[in-house]
């Protein structure tokens, strides 16, 4: 059922899907499960420090299809995947960091190209 | 048009469990999630639990944790909650109840439930 | 648990009045990812199952009269009436669906004088 004025997507769920959520639950999840009328992900990222943190949790559909296609963000690595099938399916996604790998030559040292791997599961 | 159809009584001696049935038509069982709602005689009404007949994934009121165990059956198209170790505290009306969004856009009629020697 | 508290618990009223009643969760219903209220109101005829009127705070279910309105943000609803019918002789249930376990109001019961 849509509120009024709502559009009609046609990628929208009939119904409230539910996920685990780790380090990213919302003021309204209990025991760590948010529910959301998009996606469930699981993320992957290094912190300041370069320490790999993985985050899980529920996207709203609105804006979830550019979240789930992992879109490059400069000098930071992180992977990102999203499921729908059913009730908590982000428990069983696992992405990984994408590997470091050397960019081209300009002056002086060598620097680093950030490479993304793009995830979209259904 | 979406019906939800349920027994309109049962009668339970105390200590036995009972389970009680909710045959949904009209609509697409796996589309929508199952309620159980439960009132006493002049009182509110008191959520039990749900069921996502699609994979069967269940939330409780931990109220009734260890007390309702909630199952479906896709090929009968109807929804079951089972109610153990009865006592005459859990004689009431139980409604069954279905949601998209987790506000209840339709109900059975009720099963009243009563639970005596 | 989120405890949802209605008032009046009974009120009696005569055919053609505007008819309010309130409903307030012991914490905020506004959802800030999407700026909705995560409550319904329900109507519960005698002898009857309830039956949903309004959702998300203010809108109306289909096939529901427009005299039905649903008011109200974070932790004060209305449901109003605003001329009542005879047929309106019922129980009145707000429901947060904001957090698990979903819970309900006393109820107000709206007699007819």
């Known amino acids: 059922k849509k509120e009024d004025g709502e559009s009609t997507a046609p990628t929208a769920r009939p119904k409230v899907l539910r996920c685990k959520c780790h380090h990213h639950c919302p003021e309204d999840s209990v025991n760590n499960i948010c529910s959301t009328d998009g996606y469930c992900f699981t993320m992957i990222e290094e912190d300041d420090s370069g320490t790999p943190v993985v985050t899980s949790g529920c996207l709203g559909l609105e804006g979830s299809d550019f979240q789930c296609r992992d879109t490059p963000i400069p000098h930071q690595r992180r992977s990102i995947e999203c499921c729908t099938e059913r009730n908590e399916c982000n428990k069983d996604l696992h992405p990984t960091l994408p590997p470091l790998k050397d960019r081209d030559f300009v002056d002086g040292p060598i620097h680093h190209k950030h490479h993304h791997h793009h995830h979209h599961h259904h | 048009q979406v019906q939800l159809q349920q027994p309109g009584a049962e009668l339970v001696m105390p200590g036995a469990s009972v389970k009680l049935s909710c045959k949904a038509s009209?609509?697409?069982?796996?589309?929508?999630?199952m309620h159980w709602v439960k009132q006493r005689p002049g009182q509110g009404l008191e959520w039990i639990g749900d069921?996502?007949?699609?994979?069967?994934?269940?939330n409780y009121n931990h109220k009734f944790k260890g007390k309702a165990t909630l199952t479906v059956d896709k090929s009968s198209s109807t929804a079951y909650m089972q109610l153990s170790s009865l006592t005459s505290e859990d004689s009431a009306v139980y409604y069954c109840?279905?949601?998209?969004?987790?506000?209840?856009?339709?109900w059975g009629q009720g099963t009243t439930l009563t639970v005596s020697s | 648990d989120i405890v949802m508290t209605q008032s009046p618990s009974s009120l009696a009223m005569s055919v053609g009045q505007k008819v309010t009643m309130s409903c307030k969760s012991s914490?905020?219903?506004?959802?800030?990812?999407?700026?909705?209220?995560?409550l319904a109101w329900y109507q519960q005829k005698p002898g009857q199952s309830p039956k949903l009127l309004v959702y998300?705070?203010?809108t109306r279910e289909s096939g529901v009269p427009d005299r039905f309105i649903g008011s109200g943000s974070g932790t004060d609803f209305t449901l109003t009436i605003s001329s009542v019918q005879a047929e309106d002789l019922a129980d009145y249930f707000c429901q947060q669906y904001y957090r698990i376990p979903w819970t309900f109001g006393g109820g107000t019961k709206l007699e007819i004088k």
């Open positions: 009209g609509y697409t069982l796996t589309n929508y999630w």
């Open positions: 069921i996502d007949p699609s994979d069967t994934y269940t």
């Open positions: 914490q905020s219903l506004l959802k800030s990812s999407n700026q909705k209220n995560y």
């Open positions: 998300f705070a203010s």
């Open positions: 109840a279905r949601s998209g969004w987790d506000y209840f856009d339709s």
